[in-house]
């Protein structure tokens, strides 16, 4: 945020940039949290725009019985590994085809035991406040589907009649990692020493990090004709004086007519 300065007073202004603002020869360049000619004002809204998508990664192990393990499968650049990867990926794409959050699989390791496949199932969803629930549900469906396929697609008389066959008991979910996005935490951190006074409110499922000085939200402070200003002790209303009235009170809702004061009478609206 920048405020431009013209004229002789500019050099003076340079040494007076506040709150970590820096002079660039024309104006004070203010850090994210501040604005104003001298960076003296605290912003009322901080952009904590969420990521467009949130990801989850499930570490799974399955045992493929329709392929016999060979040493070449350890080498990720071998023809054997590449072919196995292609078939396994196609098979898993079929298994998880009904899960909208499913992105794909990534084989991390193949080892002996028929072929034990250590792999990640990758999930992704559009950010909404309910993303945790969406991804939790998706991971449950992944577990159900992989359990089902490894129970159904099994070798009969030493031959597999499916794209791949599995050992029913070789299916394990090792770990589930969900990308953490905590708008409240981000908001508090970015508001720094004003963190106690900034809150997250949602509009169209998008989080907004705002102080009570930002109008139009449920926590917004109504300063009436005054101006809301943030200080280290919280939001305060700076009341104005017009030609006819002085305004006072916590929300500048008390107007005193100047003529009455000059006539030694007080009158409150």
């Amino acid at each position: 945020r920048t405020t431009t300065c013209f004229g002789d007073g500019c050099q003076n202004t340079a040494s007076r940039c506040k709150n970590g603002g820096t002079w660039d020869g024309l104006k004070c360049q203010c850090p994210n949290l501040y604005y104003g000619e001298l960076c003296e004002e605290v912003v009322s809204s901080i952009d904590i725009g969420p990521p467009e998508t949130i990801s989850a990664q499930m570490e799974l192990t399955v045992t493929v019985t329709s392929v016999k393990f060979t040493e070449e499968l350890k080498n990720h650049s071998s023809q054997e590994f590449q072919e196995f990867k292609q078939t396994f990926t196609e098979q898993m794409n079929i298994v998880y085809s009904g899960i909208p959050e499913y992105v794909g699989v990534n084989i991390t390791k193949l080892r002996l035991g028929s072929v034990v496949v250590e792999h990640d199932v990758l999930l992704r969803t559009k950010y909404t406040p309910e993303y945790k629930t969406v991804l939790d549900n998706a991971t449950e469906v992944v577990k159900e589907k992989i359990t089902k396929v490894t129970t159904q697609q099994i070798m009969i008389n030493d031959i597999c009649s499916d794209m791949m066959c599995f050992n029913t008991t070789g299916t394990q979910v090792q770990n589930i990692t969900v990308t953490q996005y905590d708008p409240e935490e981000d908001c508090r951190k970015m508001a720094k020493e004003y963190g106690d006074y900034f809150v997250v409110e949602y509009r169209d499922q998008k989080p907004y990090c705002i102080s009570p000085c930002e109008p139009g939200f449920s926590v917004s402070k109504n300063c009436n004709l005054g101006k809301c200003q943030m200080s280290l002790s919280g939001p305060q209303c700076l009341c104005v004086t017009t030609e006819t009235h002085w305004y006072s009170g916590e929300t500048c809702n008390q107007g005193t007519q100047k003529s009455l004061v000059y006539g030694h009478h007080h009158h409150h609206h």
Partner: nanobody, 123 residues
């Protein structure tokens, strides 16, 4: 690029025999697997027989005891000896190969294919 070429198809009477051959462009599959599939008119492709580099062989129930799969690694060739042929054996026969030591007779498990050779069993 891997190439597989089948030969040996033709017209044969019920009860007769036929030997199919498949020539691979190199010996790439000597450490993997090779197989025969067939596709009758209007039907899905189905597995017939499989042989792996470890010597293991497997057959579809419908051909067990009648067909024999074998390979000659020195000649990079695969064979299918078909005896006691029946009308229902009529189909296009395909050779398939894999770098993997497979135990699967599902066409989706196989990545490399020949163009096929026609076998007609009819009197």
């Amino acid at each position: 690029d891997v190439q597989l070429v089948e030969s040996g198809g033709g017209l044969v009477q019920p009860g007769g025999s036929l030997r199919l051959s498949c020539a691979a462009s190199d010996n790439t599959f000597s450490r993997g697997s090779m197989s025969w599939f067939r596709q009758a008119p209007g039907k899905e492709r189905e597995g017939v027989a499989i042989i792996s580099s470890d010597g293991w062989t497997g057959y579809a129930d419908s051909v067990k005891g009648r067909f024999t799969i074998s390979q000659d690694n020195a000649k990079n060739s695969l064979y299918l000896q078909m005896n006691s042929l029946r009308a229902e054996d009529t189909a296009v026969y395909y050779c398939a190969a894999s770098f993997l030591v497979l135990r699967a007779l599902n066409p989706k498990a196989w990545h490399y294919w020949g163009q096929g050779t026609m076998v007609t069993v009819s009197s």
